[in-house]
């Protein structure tokens, strides 16, 4: 028996369902009574789900997994993982045994989009050209860790005087806070981009300083 899985990682959004695809080619006359199917975590060998002795043995993994019982006889051994969590990320191995056995591993990459950044300025009043200001760009509840970029109003990257911190919450999602310190000109626009490297999802925030009052322009 030959087991086939997708070579590319399966990308799943947090709180959605994911399908880890696995298939085999059944011989003519194959019946489910001959099938032993085991899904397990590749690294720890922890059992996730199994089908043995002609029946589904159920989920051994937080009761969030399921097979596709009607499709098993056609060689579809895929696993459905419900309400994906950050902690589900990793490699899963699909073992299929009929007369002989084969196995293959599939990777699950978990992702969550970052929120539109909120921009804050300190100090935020009585600003004058030559003043040093701190612009903070905050974006929340994303996964994995973000890439953060700053650009000035002409699209040139700002790399000096940038400090970025990322903290995971209890669900493993990251809150990003990036701080840019700049000396003000007569006016200026400063933009922050928070990029999710897995989803290639960009979230932009901008602040334009034109004396008083400050403006926070809409996204372009």
């Amino acid at each position: 028996v030959e087991v086939q899985v997708s070579e590319d990682p399966v990308v799943a959004l947090v709180d959605t369902d994911a399908t880890l695809r696995c298939s085999f080619s059944p011989e003519p006359g194959f019946s489910l009574a001959q099938l032993n199917l085991i899904w397990q975590l590749t690294d720890t060998k922890q059992l996730v789900h199994s089908f043995t002795e002609g029946r589904d043995q159920g989920s051994a993994y937080s009761n969030r997994t399921a097979l596709f019982p009607d499709l098993l006889v056609q060689g579809n051994a895929s696993l459905r993982l419900q309400r994906v969590r950050v902690t589900d990320e990793g490699s899963y191995t699909c073992f299929v045994s009929i007369q002989d056995f084969d196995s293959a591993a599939v990777s699950l990459q978990v992702a969550a989009p970052y929120s539109k950044p909120s921009m804050t300025l300190e100090p935020n009043k009585d600003l004058r050209p030559g003043n040093m200001v701190t612009i903070t760009c905050s974006s929340y509840q994303g996964y994995p860790e973000a890439e953060v970029f700053w650009k000035d109003g002409q699209g040139v990257p700002l790399t000096g005087n940038v400090t970025t911190s990322q903290m995971a919450n209890e669900r493993g999602l990251f809150d990003v806070h990036s701080v840019l310190r700049v000396v003000l000109g007569a006016n200026g626009t400063y933009s922050c981009l928070v990029r999710n490297p897995v989803l290639q999802q960009d979230a932009h925030g901008s602040v334009t300083i034109t004396g008083q009052p400050l403006t926070f322009p809409p996204e372009a």
Epitope: F149, K151, D152, G153, Q154, G155, V156, P157, L158, G185, G188, S191, L193, L199, Q200, Q201, D202, A203, H204, S206, E219, A220
Partner: antibody, heavy 121, light 112 residues
């Protein structure tokens, strides 16, 4: 008419430096960044870096960092790029180009005619 | 770094014919928020500087004839010239601006 006028061809010796100029006209010079691009037979078009004419902020391609220096003179609407410690591999045409766009997507809508730099002993 | 690969490196067609050239990027250039691809096409005629033809993968720069069409998304892009004219003799470059800027190696268009 929007134009970027570049300085003339340069013949320099290995190890020396060259400074190329790019003068903007027909638009408000400090409203747009100036990018520099190298064109050689070996490497096609290569982005060197960018300078924001209003913010005086520069960003260099890692390959050219430490050897290229971009500056602007706002009073004359001119951008400059100096390239130091030249070798034969720096023989190329160097273009300045105006950065145009919005948000985080920028493209080069106006180009200078190019400055040919030849490095030879 | 994002690598841009253009093909073919050169091609020759007769005036009036349709031509297509390809540009592939090593990672997606699609901004999922704006649904725009950060890809531009430039035309460089012999002895001249490059000229912007297309940006956002498919938006024609003002003044560019409508026989030039950009298409594609993600990692695969195409520039099509529906009815090639003698003045289209040039090298065509694609360029990504998703992460800094990199150009493809160019496609040289020759007229038979």
């Amino acid at each position: 008419e929007v134009q970027l006028q570049q300085s003339g061809p340069e013949l320099v010796r290995p190890g020396e430096s060259v400074k190329i100029s790019c003068k903007g006209s027909g638009y408000t010079f400090t409203d747009y960044a100036i990018h520099w691009v190298k064109q050689s037979h070996a490497k096609s078009l290569e982005w060197i870096g960018v300078i924001s004419t209003y913010y005086d902020n520069t960003y260099y391609n890692q390959k050219f960092k430490g050897r290229a220096t971009m500056t602007v003179d706002k009073s004359s609407s001119t951008a400059y790029m100096e390239l130091a410690r030249l070798t034969s591999e720096d023989s190329a045409i160097y273009y300045c180009a105006r950065g145009y766009g919005s948000s985080f997507n920028w493209y080069f809508d106006v180009w200078g005619a190019g400055t040919t730099v030849t490095v030879s002993s | 770094d994002i690598v841009m690969t253009q093909s073919p490196s050169s091609l020759a067609v007769s005036a009036g014919e349709k031509v297509t050239m390809s540009c592939k990027s090593s990672q997606s250039l699609l901004n999922s928020r704006t649904r725009k691809n950060y890809l531009a096409w430039y035309q460089q005629k012999p002895g001249q500087s490059p000229k912007l033809l297309i940006y956002w993968a498919s938006t024609r720069e003002s003044g560019v004839p409508d026989r030039f069409t950009g298409s594609g998304s993600g990692t695969d892009f195409t520039l099509t010239i529906t009815s090639v004219q003698a003045e289209d003799l040039a090298v065509y470059y694609c360029k990504q601006s998703y992460n800094l800027y990199t150009f493809g190696g160019g496609t040289k268009l020759e007229i038979k």
